[in-house]
Interface confidence: medium
């Protein structure tokens, strides 16, 4: 979606209320990969009813791409040419280099719960042993 | 550059109804969440109600809910808040505030309009 | 609601000085903290948001830090414009919280 930002540069936060958060994330946990190839990074928001306004992708400090509820996805200019919104609220990455290597945040914007955050490592490596993890499907 | 103008202020009685306005240019209206957070004379900053870019979600301080009722007009870039039943402690200035697309905290603020309850 | 608690309500202080204002949630709000600058009479303008990130065109001596409950927002070195009131502000749950503020006054 054409925000009309230059770029992010990290954060989050968003709605939630005085209920008590008993959404719980569940993830990819940690995957590899191999460097060249894509990934697919999954989150799931279960266990609560509360209502996603926006889902924040995040690597470390960095803001890679937003889903928002009225707006649709935005991806953050400097990572355009390598990530790919979906699938649902998922989110592909592609040409996989060494250092991509790292820790991945979902942050799911509720309410009136509050913000939930998922945590997915990935380790990019060189040879063609890497082993994916399983596929994660939101039902 | 990004401007936000509010309206619609005054003195009013208690029980009475105001329509604040907030009329935004500079930027795309459409793609930005808006705040209406007040200032009590002489106090601190109060967050009272929040409308997502498309209205989809609209959220209320409980001290407003029922009475206050936040709308915008995205073909008009003009943002609202229709106030009833106001008592004396609404007394404040009312700024109108645009959310960062990423997250919510404000970061462009009008200059505010002032709304007195006192009979 | 997440209760702001801000420390000092008050400071004086000197052109030149370093400045240290704290923030504390009442729970965990993560890194989600802002921070604003008001002057008398003017809207408040947004420093810091997300904790540590420093809202373009703000100058570098304003700095952010902590996550959880506690933040600080950093002054290094106080010019003439920055005697103001600085908020601090949860954006991490409904409904948004405010500080009581923090008035720098010139000593």
């Known amino acids: 979606y054409p925000y009309d930002v230059p770029d992010y540069a990290g954060g989050g936060g968003s709605g939630g209320g005085g209920s008590m958060m008993t959404g719980t994330i569940e993830t990819t946990g940690n995957i590899s990969a191999e460097k060249g190839g894509s990934i697919i990074l999954q989150c799931h928001l279960s266990s609560t009813t509360a209502q996603v306004t926006q889902v924040n992708w995040e690597q470390q400090d960095q803001l890679l791409a937003i889903c928002n509820a009225d707006l649709g996805w935005h991806i953050s200019p400097s990572f355009k040419d390598r990530v790919a919104p979906g699938p649902g609220l998922g989110l592909t990455l592609q040409s996989l280099t060494v250092n991509d290597t790292g820790e991945y945040f979902c942050i799911y914007h509720t309410y009136p719960d509050g913000a939930y955050t998922g945590r997915i490592f990935l380790e990019v490596l060189e040879s063609s042993v890497a082993e994916h993890g399983a596929r994660f499907q939101i039902p | 550059e990004v401007q936000l103008v509010e309206s619609g202020g005054g003195l009013v009685q208690p029980g009475g109804s105001l329509r604040l306005s907030c009329a935004a240019s500079g930027f795309t209206f459409s793609n930005f969440g808006m705040h209406w957070v007040r200032q009590a004379p002489g106090k601190g900053l109060e967050w009272v109600a929040f409308?997502?870019?498309?209205?989809?979600?609209?959220y209320y301080a409980d001290t407003v809910k029922g009475r206050f009722t936040i709308s915008r007009d995205n073909a008009k870039n003009s943002l609202y808040l229709q106030m009833n039943s106001l008592r004396a402690e609404d007394t404040a200035v009312y700024y109108c505030?645009?959310?960062?697309?990423?997250?919510?905290?404000?970061?462009?603020w009008g200059q505010g309009t002032m709304v007195t309850v006192s009979s | 609601d997440i209760q702001m608690t801000q420390s000092p309500s008050s400071l004086s202080a000197s052109v030149g000085d370093r400045v240290t204002i704290t923030c504390r949630a009442s729970?965990?709000?993560?890194?989600?903290l802002a921070w604003y600058q008001q002057k008398p009479g003017k809207a408040p303008k947004l420093l810091i948001y997300s904790g540590s990130t420093l809202q373009s065109g703000v100058p570098s001596r304003f700095s952010g830090s902590g996550s959880g409950t506690d933040f600080t927002l950093t002054i290094s070195s106080l010019q003439p414009e920055d005697f103001a009131t600085y908020y601090c502000q949860q954006h991490n749950e409904y409904p948004w919280t405010f500080g009581g503020g923090t008035k720098v006054e010139i000593k």
């Open positions: 729970k965990s709000i993560s890194k989600y």
């Open positions: 409308i997502s870019s498309g209205s989809s979600s609209i």
């Open positions: 505030a645009r959310m960062r697309l990423d997250y919510y905290a404000m970061d462009y």
